[in-house]
Every structure is written in C-alpha cells, then in structure tokens.
Interface confidence: low
C-alpha cells in the first residue's frame, strides 16, 4: 500500500515570496508523484515546479496559486493511487492603485458647497488600513469638514470649499507591507474672490520703431486689480511711466501698448492680478526686437549634365526665424518640377547646360531681408581644338607639344611621359592653354607623351610620339689642354655622336701631317714614343653628311713628370731648437714646391719670423714648440702633374742626463741638434 510520510498542509504565504508544499510517500514498488490544483494536473514552470515529490514556488502568485492543492502518488504497475489531504495558501498581498473621484460623477460637476467623495484604490489581503494626505500632509479622521471610511476606502469632504483644494494621495499598510497611490487626484475648487486668468499675454517679436501690444485679463468677485511691471520691477501706469517707457499705454481692459519700440524696451513684462483673497497671479511675456544677420557666402558650384544636385541655403540667424526662398533670373522657384525648392535646398534634377547661371537665396523676417548669390556652372566634356602630334624635336632646343581643348569650366590639362605624370620643373612647363614646353630637349626625351583634359563632366586624352633629332657633338668634348710624358707611349681619345654616325680624324693645327710614329685610329691619337716635337696644337674633326662637321682644339704639352730628389724624413727635435725638413723635386717644366703643415698650406708670404722655405724647397722652423708637432707634406707641381710626400715632426722636452750615461751618449732616436 502507498503511505504518505509527509502530507502538504495549508499555510500563510506572501505574494511574490518563496513557498513549499511538502509531500513524501512510501510504497513497496516504484511510484510516480504529481500534483493537482482544483483537480487539474499542475504543469511545471520556472515559477512553480516539482522538487522531488514536493511542490516548490519561486514566487507565490495570488491569482494563479489560489485553490486547493493535492499530492497524488500512483503505482503504474498495479494502478493503485493515493491522494494526500487538501492544502491551500492564505496569500497576503497589497497592491497600489489610483485615487479616483467617486462623487460627483465628473470633475466638471464639482462646485463650492457640494459633497466630494474620493476613493483610494489600494487593495490587499488582509484588508489594509488607509491614510489620506492633502499636499503631502496627513488628514486625521474626524477633522472638520471631512470623514474617512476605512471600510470603503473613501474620503468624503462635506461640504467642499476652496480650502479643500490640493493634491490628494493615500497610503495603506497591512501585515504584508505598505503601498501608496500610483496616481493622485488634484481637487480644484474655485473661490470667486480668487483672481483667475482670462487672457494671458504672449511673447511678441517686433521690428524697431513698430508697436507692440500685450493683452492681459483676470476675473474675480469682486473684480481683481491688475498691474504691469517691466524687467526691473518698475510699475507701468498711465500716470507714472519709467523714462524708457514714455510711449506705454495701459488700457482699461488690461492691455499694454508700446509704440515706437526701441532696443531698450526689449525684455520681460509682468502682468499681476490680485483678487480679494488668494495669492497674486503673475503672468510673464517677453518683448523681442526682430533681428537678422548676414548670410554666409556660397562657393561657386560645378555640376555635370544629367546628374541631380542640391545647394543648401543656410538661413541667417534671426528673430523671428527668417523664411527662405530661392530665385533664378528674378523669378521665385516653384516647390516641384525639374528645378525647384525643397525646404532650404535648391534642387536641380537631370541637370541641363541651360541651368547654368546665378541663383539667389533670399531670407527675410520682420527685421529685413538678406540675399546671397551662387554661381552654378554646368560642366561639359572637353572637345579637341588641337591634339598632340607625333613630333621631331631638335636636341638642345625648346620643343612644344599642343593639347588644345575647350569645355565648361576651363579644362584641367595634365601631361604624362611614359605613363608617369609630368610635374612642372625647370625643364617642363605646361602653359595655360595646355601646351607642353620642353625647355631644352635631351636625347632621352624621345618617348611617348599623353595629355589628358578634364572637367567634372569627364575627360579626353591623346598621345604623341617624340623623336629627338640628335645634334652633332663630341661625347665627351676633349680636354683643351693635355700633357704627355716625355719618352713614353700616349693616347688622346676623341669621340662624337650625331643623327648619323660621324667620321672622326685628327690633324695638326698648322695643317702639317702627323709624323709616322703618330697614328689616328678611329678617333684616338696614338703616340708610340713621345718626343719634344710632338708638343703643339691638334684639331679633332667629326663630320657626317646631314650635319656637316665640328672641330675640337687640343693643346698638347710634352713634360718630364715630377720625381723627388730629396724627400723629408721623420724628424724629432728638442723644444726650442731648430727643425729642418728637406725636399727637392725635379721635372719639366721645373716644379714649384709648397708645404702643408697640420692640414693647411703654409703661405711663404705669411710664415712669420720662425719659418722659412729655401729656394731648393727645404723648410726650416726655428725655436720649435710642442704645437709645431704633426705631419708636414711637401707638394711639388707643374702644369702637367703634381706629386706629394710627407713626414712627421716630433717636438720633445730635452731629457735631464742620468749619472750612468757617459758623455756623448747618442739619444735613442734620430735627432737634429743645433
């Protein structure tokens, strides 16, 4: 038999809190347990679900969990079934609601001296206790003119008067907790002696020197007083006007008129109504002076035919907000069509060339009118006036390639050479009309050139081949003065290029023929063994058929190259003594000798008293000092060649002789002793 060890029991529960209905069974065979609510099986949800054989509630719900729960155990083999005792929840809850008018039926029916009943729609279990408030202050039962019925949750005002006006709210509390009204009720019972607004003044914007009118009216029994004040609390009456409001008039109906308004009249005006009872009512209105600023400039616009474009007109700052419209050729644009105005925008749909021209944006308000023009250009694809032609350009001369096009706006022309953009520099120049100038044509300028002419509407391009007509020239030009070493072999080269390969020959300047030991081999003059007679003037002649001939004159000098007879040696000198650095050179022409000391040339005219260079080239330094130490270079040169040799000079302190050294012992290094 199935036996319940634990049965569910009825219990108190709190709305939204956890709960558990326990159920435990014992049986000889396997059983499955399920739950019934009012006889219907309970389905598991996230909120309510089986936990073992018990039923767990994550959050009790007063609507879904009201009723009778029963735990059922069933043996599926034998079909035996056992049911527990019934159990239910006593759910405690409280729920906020609004304060509503119960009597009379509508707010419109509330009159002074009538009974007014308000109901607090806070509900709960157990029934809560209610507390009423007016403007946040608690109302206690039994106070004059009102009664509180906790059973019916009502507040009755009997009779209702102006003193009952205010914001009514309620709160309720029970064993479960507390809640306050979700929506409060404003009771407004007019007192005839209180001032009430009939007509409130409105903000006004006026142009300078125009007039402004503020209307203001109150009603009460007896009639209320009305007073106007300006910004600084200065009263405005027909008898006493402040100096800056001389042109102000207050009419019997309360309206205020200001004539010939000036900037100092702008500001806040206050209309104050005061009844026999109750607070004063203060109404405010502002007087603004109309103004309009200048409009920003438009950039000229370039559009392409067939496209749709818009130009936005930013209205200038102004008060009131300026109205904006577009005009073209003096005519206001429509709000639809192909060229029209949409909001502040000028819209050009499917642009045609005829749409080009000046469009004007106008802005206006009470303060005046402003306008700004925008120039619209409709771009066209460039067309050719003159394409670049294949050209033969002469080397060394300026060359020109045309690229003449026309379009609107003026086309932009760029040139490419071998697909590389040409940037203007000292050799290339692009004229305003698109023509390319090559300032001094060089051989390697012979290539493809392409010009491209563009507008926003599109571009056209054409290319041309440049062939450079090479000039007849020496490559390189021979040196005009050259030296050959006496009694040695020597060569003097001469080469040239031209449109056709030139022939090259040498001759003596005096026209005499070359000696038999001198040969002219394809432009190279060859001396087998140089003699003194080989010196003289020679001419290299390069010629071809189309370009004629060119000549280069060369003066050949025969020389004996320089050799040193005496070279300076590494020298060490005692401080204060004299140093002698010897140097002698020979050659033809006779070489001249110069000295370089410590990386600067020693100028014989500026040597000073301590240094002297002899005719034979030797250098003497008297009274040597440590700063004279260093490398000294002897340089021998003539018109044909130059040669140098160097040696170091060391300046040392004279050592103090030691006892062990006998007289006349030589120093450990080569020394000049003077």
């Amino acid at each position: 038999a199935i036996v319940f060890i634990k049965q569910p029991s009825s219990q108190d529960a709190l709305q939204g809190r956890r709960a558990l209905l326990r159920c435990e069974v014992e049986a000889p065979g396997p059983v499955h347990v399920y739950w019934l609510l009012d006889g219907a099986p309970v389905q598991d949800t996230e909120r309510r679900f089986a936990q073992g054989s018990s039923l767990s509630f994550a959050a009790v719900d007063r609507l879904q969990d009201s009723g009778t729960f029963q735990c059922v155990a069933r043996d599926d083999v034998t079909g035996e079934e056992a049911r527990s005792a019934n159990a239910s929840f006593n759910i405690k809850w409280i729920e906020a609601g609004p304060v509503v008018l119960k009597h009379p039926a509508s707010e419109a029916e509330i009159q002074p001296q009538t009974q007014v009943t308000l109901r607090c729609h806070i509900d709960g279990h157990p029934r809560p206790t209610y507390q009423w408030f007016r403007d946040g202050t608690p109302l206690s039962d039994g106070q004059s003119n009102h009664t509180v019925s906790s059973k019916e949750r009502n507040l009755t005002l009997r009779p209702a008067g102006p003193e009952h006006s205010g914001l009514y709210s309620c709160c309720a509390h029970s064993a479960f907790g507390q809640a306050c009204s979700s929506q409060n009720f404003t009771l407004s019972i007019a007192d005839e002696s209180f001032a009430r607004v009939v007509l409130a003044p409105q903000d006004v914007v006026v142009a300078r020197y125009e007039e402004a009118m503020f209307h203001c009216q109150f009603s009460a029994q007896p009639p209320p007083s009305l007073q106007w004040l300006f910004e600084d609390e200065t009263p405005i009456t027909n008898r006493s006007r402040p100096p800056h409001l001389r042109r102000a008039t207050v009419f019997a109906n309360g309206s205020l008129l200001l004539t010939q308004v000036r900037p100092r009249n702008a500001g806040i005006y206050r209309c104050i109504g005061q009844g026999q009872r109750g607070p004063p009512i203060i109404l405010e209105a502002t007087l603004h002076l109309a103004e309009i600023e200048d409009m920003p400039l438009f950039e000229p616009r370039v559009f392409t035919a067939g496209s749709e474009e818009r130009v936005t007109c930013l209205p200038p700052k102004g008060l009131p907000e300026p109205s904006v419209w577009w005009e073209h050729a003096g005519v206001r644009l429509p709000t639809h069509g192909r060229v029209y105005q949409k909001g502040h925008e000028l819209v050009l749909a499917n642009i045609a060339e005829s749409d080009a021209g000046v469009y004007t944006c106008h802005a206006a308000n009470l303060a005046g009118q402003r306008r700004q023009d925008v120039n619209i250009t409709v771009a066209t694809v460039p067309s050719w006036l003159k394409k670049p032609q294949d050209s033969q350009l002469e080397e060394g001369k300026p060359g020109y390639l045309d690229c003449l096009t026309q379009a609107t706006p003026k086309p932009t022309v760029v040139w490419y050479r071998n697909q590389m953009l040409i940037s203007e520099d000292s050799r290339f120049e692009v004229f305003k009309n698109g023509t390319l100038r090559i300032n001094s044509v060089e051989v390697y300028d012979g290539t493809w050139y392409r010009c491209m002419s563009s507008t926003p509407a599109g571009s056209i391009e054409a290319q041309a081949r440049v062939q450079v007509l090479e000039k007849l020239k020496f490559t390189p030009p021979p040196q005009p003065q050259q030296c050959m070493e006496f009694d040695k072999e020597a060569t003097v080269p001469c080469s040239a290029t031209g449109r056709e390969k030139p022939t090259i020959k040498w001759e003596r300047a005096d026209g005499s023929s070359l000696p038999e030991w001198v040969t002219d081999n394809a432009g190279t003059l060859h001396f087998a063994r140089v003699t003194r007679d080989d010196a003289g003037n020679y001419t290299c002649i390069a010629s071809n058929g189309p370009q004629g001939q060119i000549r280069a004159h060369v003066q050949l000098t025969v020389a004996v190259f320089i050799t040193f007879k005496v070279e300076p040696e590494r020298t060490t000198v005692y401080q204060g003594h004299t140093a002698l650095l010897q140097c002698e050179a020979q050659g033809d022409p006779k070489p001249l000798i110069q000295w370089k000391g410590k990386d600067r040339i020693l100028d014989p005219t500026k040597l000073g008293p301590r240094m002297h260079i002899f005719q034979n080239g030797s250098l003497v330094i008297h009274d040597v000092a440590p700063e004279d130490s260093g490398r000294y270079t002897c340089i021998a040169g003539n018109s044909c060649n130059i040669k140098h040799t160097e040696a170091p000079l060391y300046v040392v302190d004279k050592p103090v002789p030691e006892e062990s050294e006998g007289p006349g012992s030589p120093p450990p290094y080569k020394m000049i002793q003077t």
Epitope: R301, V302, F303, E309, T455, G458, S459
Partner: nanobody
Framework: QVQLQESGGGSVQAGGSLRLSCTAS????????MVWYRQAPGNEYEWLST???????YYADSVKGRFTISRDNAKNTVYLNMSRVKPEDTAVYYC????????????????????????WGQGTQVTVSS
Amino acid sequence: QVQLQESGGGSVQAGGSLRLSCTASGFTFDDYDMVWYRQAPGNEYEWLSTVSRGGNLYYADSVKGRFTISRDNAKNTVYLNMSRVKPEDTAVYYCAADLRSVPSTYRARTCRGRYCRDYWGQGTQVTVSS
C-alpha cells in the same frame, strides 16, 4: 573580384573617438582616389573626405578639424580617424574608390550619389550617444 570592406564601427559616447578602416582588394589600390561617405537614416549620402592617389587630403566643412583621413598603400587600406564625435555623426559610413580622371576636388563638392564612385563598400554603422 573587387572588394571594399569597412570595419571599426560601433557605439561611442559624444566627445569620444573611433577609427574606421577600409581594406581593398581586386584592383590596383595605388591608382585610386579613396573616399569616405556617410548616410544617416532618411538622408542622402554625405561626402566626408577624400585622399587622392597622390596623397592630397580633402574634407567637408562638417568634419574639418575633427576627422582625419589617411591611406597605407602597402596594406591596401584607407583610414578615417574620428575624434570629438557628436550625436549627429550617427550614420552608416561607406568607403569608396575612384579611378576617374575628374579632379577629386570638383567631385567632392558636386557629386553626392552612389553613382559618383567606381567601387563601394557595404558600410559600417557608427552610433554616437549623448
């Protein structure tokens, strides 16, 4: 085939910064001007900035001083650095590529629609909250 892929969009607070990238493939990147556009809901395409193939930079007045365009030809990528963003910068941001011979300065001022560009990306959403 030609592809332009924008990235880097997302949500950012007003006054903050964002860096958009656009990576290109399927064409010779160095030959093209690269352009950034945006489109706010219900609005037209708005041109923002162009970096020409020669490296010249052009900006719309609405973003001048706040946005910076740059390109890295080695990575086939164009960037848009957005700083001091405003709520009105909320839009879908597109990058585009252009091989046209028309100088980019003209086109930037005059051409608004998608037809003005040779290639377009799919766009990346940028949302600026205040």
